[in-house]
């Protein structure tokens, strides 16, 4: 019987949380808290919004974003795209991994102009050491941050 | 090569399902089926709606609730909050872990007053032995139970 | 200390992606891409839309489907059911595992033509060797396929 090679190693895992600095408005990915509160990194690293893989393998990656607004003003995108994207040194552009499109404005009712919606993504992808995963939301102006529990980003090796 | 300490132990996991008794109307957390049908506990225990951790570590915790209604009568909350909360002996109040807010009433259309919506939460959190995780939904009157497949609560160690 | 039996084995995992052939219109389950792009099978097999278990155990199974449409006319399904179902040699009918009902047409506003919605399911279930899991969506006409990132189906042993 061959002893398991993962034996004494920790299984890579991370959970990053939304913070006031998450939304940059720069067209870049969302940024995340990595240490305070519920946030942690174990066997993964972080760089400018990205979870960086240090050990190759299959990972369940996930993200949730809390969306909200008041009414549906003209000029605001009627479709929200929330996605997890891979950056790899082997290719110049980000690669879509898991994506959702939603029309949250339809949540507003005649009696209540305030609406809330949530988008969750999760799935298993193969990641090589050095590859990065980021979260993007278009239009990010509709993302509602509060205390790190409503918008987050994480992964663990399976 | 150091042999893995988890070697002969089972990896803690649980999946609890919604039942007629889940909604108490008491302001407490949702209650769950732990044994019948698809429900099980393996290396975790259960107490009054809570998954109780017996082995410290990082856990992917998740919950889905099925929401539904007929129209959107005034007096019924236009915002639903669905969350996973931690109870710890070290702190008197529940701690928010993962939370979603939704406005499901916006699902009703002019032609169909009946609406359905679903809320899913999942993420990795660190839990100590003896700590508990519960699910709360406000307003729980909109939770639609049936056969344990539409509303559920689970966890597994990562 | 007993060495772990999983030692040198890979942990079963799979991620299958939506493709043009996914929607058959035959009343059967959705079909999936198993090899190209992000899709893979590791320690699980595939047959006619089903993930087939080769090693008994507890699995976290998940699926996301992207829904979309133009307007919400009467006659178009007002309720969408998205579910994961088990097929077992021990029982003639499919067994519901995880199910969501949504009313995505409520996403359309009076002025906004196009609506998008997404449904995510995930949970831990016990599966025996030879058992199968499939995804069904009713009404599947509203499922929007594109590039395998918006509708998918996967599992991994926990």
């Amino acid at each position: 019987l061959i002893q398991e090679r993962r034996s004494h190693e920790v299984n890579p895992a991370a959970h990053l949380t939304g913070a006031n600095s998450s939304l940059t408005g720069s067209g870049g990915p969302l940024l995340w808290e990595t240490q305070l509160g519920l946030a942690f990194l174990r066997g993964l690293s972080y760089h400018d919004g990205a979870l960086v893989v240090t050990k190759a393998g299959y990972y369940y990656i996930y993200s949730k974003v809390q969306l909200g607004g008041v009414g549906c003003p003209l000029g605001l995108a009627s479709t929200i795209t929330h996605g997890l994207y891979k950056r790899t040194p082997r290719y110049p552009e980000e690669l879509e991994l898991l994506v959702s499109q939603q029309s949250p404005c339809g949540r507003a009712t005649s009696s209540s102009r305030v609406w809330w919606d949530s988008s969750f993504l999760g799935g298993v992808v193969h990641l090589e050491a050095g590859e990065e995963v980021v979260v993007r939301v278009l239009d990010e102006r509709l993302v509602r941050l509060r205390d790190g529990t409503r918008s987050y980003f994480g992964a663990f090796m399976v | 090569l150091i042999q893995e300490r988890r070697s002969h132990e089972v990896n803690p996991a649980a999946h609890l399902t919604g039942a007629n008794s889940s909604l108490t109307g008491s302001g407490g957390p949702l209650l769950w089926e732990t044994q019948l049908g698809l429900a099980f506990l393996r290396g975790l225990s259960y107490h009054d709606g809570a998954l109780v951790v017996t082995k410290a570590g990082y856990y992917y915790i998740y919950s889905k609730v099925q929401l539904g209604g007929v129209g959107c009568p005034l007096g019924l909350a236009s915002t639903i909050t669905h969350g996973l909360y931690k109870r710890t002996p070290r702190y008197p109040e529940e701690l928010e872990l993962l939370v979603s807010q939704q406005s499901p009433c916006g699902r009703a259309t002019s032609s169909s007053r009946v609406w359905w919506d679903s809320s899913f939460l999942g993420g990795v959190v660190h839990l100590e032995a003896g700590e508990e995780v519960v699910v709360r939904v406000l307003d729980e009157r909109l939770v639609r139970l049936r056969d344990g497949t539409r509303s559920y609560f689970g966890a597994f160690m990562v | 200390l007993i060495q772990e039996r999983r030692s040198h084995e890979v942990n079963p995992a799979a991620h299958l992606t939506g493709a043009n052939s996914s929607l058959t219109g035959s009343g059967g389950p959705l079909l999936w891409e198993t090899q190209l792009g992000l899709a893979f099978l590791r320690g699980l097999s595939y047959h006619d839309g089903a993930l087939v278990v080769t090693k008994a155990g507890y699995y976290y199974i998940y699926s996301k489907v992207q829904l979309g449409g133009v307007g919400c006319p009467l006659g178009l399904a007002s309720t969408i059911t998205h579910g994961l179902y088990k097929r077992t040699p021990r029982y003639p009918e499919e067994l519901e595992l995880l199910v969501s009902q949504q009313s995505p047409c409520g996403r359309a506003t009076s002025s906004s033509r196009v609506w998008w919605d997404s449904s995510f399911l995930g949970g831990v279930v016990h599966l025996e060797a030879g058992e199968e899991v499939v995804v069904r969506v009713l009404d599947e006409r509203l499922v929007r396929l594109r590039d395998g990132t918006r509708s998918y189906f996967g599992a991994f042993m926990v």
């Epitope: - | - | 133009v70 307007g71 006319p73 006409r141």
Partner: antibody, heavy 122, light 107 residues
Framework: QVQLQESGPGLVKPSGTLSLTCAVS?????????WNWVRQPPGKGLEWIGE???????NCNPSLKSRVTISVDKSKNQFSLKMNSVTAADTAVYYC???????????????WGQGTTVTVSS | DIQMTQSPSSLSASVGDRVSITCQAS??????LNWYQQKPGKAPKLLIY???NLETGVPSRFSGSGSGTDFTFTISSLQPEDIATYYC?????????FGGGTKVEIK
């Protein structure tokens, strides 16, 4: 493949009612497509009038809504346009056209009739 | 209503030239934009849907790009049979609205 054919009077008196029918052939009006009316005044651009689904659900241009009725007859595989209180400004070529599927997310008007000229004059 | 502003309103180019037409929406319409060709005395014909997708059977010299509020329609190499008026149309919001059209002629 699907073909559309408009029919109706070519001349309508002011304040009268314009009535047009569009016959669908080569396919069923009970598909998930929306069925549209578009018009084009002489020498001008295109204006959307409205649409109907086989179940009877309709949407109309707000600028015309008070005067327009769109209906469907599934037994005859056709849909119709009625516009009342017409004036010379309603003189145009009227097209029926198939829109995108309700169970779809693009809305190209991909099949058109050849158009019928309606003149409003006494 | 969403206003669709097309420019130029007319253009003249030589056979083989690259021709571009722009369409600007008065608000963000994502990629919910189509392009049509209308030859004199004929019904419009759908060429491009969802801003950049070529309708089946349409020659590859036609293309579209853009998202949000600014869109471009291009004929990579103008052919004599391309003489027509071209219209953009949005379907993000009701009512569906068209641009004013661009008349393309051969020099």
């Amino acid at each position: 493949q699907v073909q559309l054919q408009e029919s109706g009077p070519g001349l309508v008196k002011p304040s009268g009612t314009l009535s047009l029918t569009c016959a669908v052939s080569g396919g069923s009006i009970s598909s998930t497509h929306w069925w549209n009316w578009v018009r084009q005044p002489p020498g001008k651009g295109l204006e959307w009038i409205g649409e109907i689904y086989h179940s009877g659900s309709t949407n109309c241009n707000p600028s015309l809504k008070s005067r327009v009725t769109i209906s469907v007859d599934k037994s005859k595989n056709q849909f119709s346009l009625k516009m009342n209180s017409v004036t010379a400004a309603d003189t145009a070529v009227y097209y029926c056209t198939r829109g995108g599927a309700a169970a779809g997310t693009n809305y190209g008007l991909d099949v058109w009739g050849q158009g019928t000229t309606v003149t409003v004059s006494s | 209503d969403i206003q669709m502003t097309q420019s130029p309103s007319s253009l003249s180019a030589s056979v083989g030239d690259r021709v571009s037409i722009t369409c600007q929406a008065s608000q963000d319409i994502s990629n919910y934009l189509n392009w049509y060709q209308q030859k004199p005395g004929k019904a419009p014909k759908l060429l491009i849907y969802d801003a950049s997708n070529l309708e089946t059977g349409v020659p590859s010299r036609f293309s579209g790009s853009g998202s949000g509020t600014d869109f471009t329609f291009t004929i990579s190499s103008l052919q004599p049979e391309d003489i027509a008026t071209y219209y953009c149309q949005q379907y993000d919001n009701l009512p569906l609205t068209f641009g004013g059209g661009t008349k393309v002629e051969i020099k």
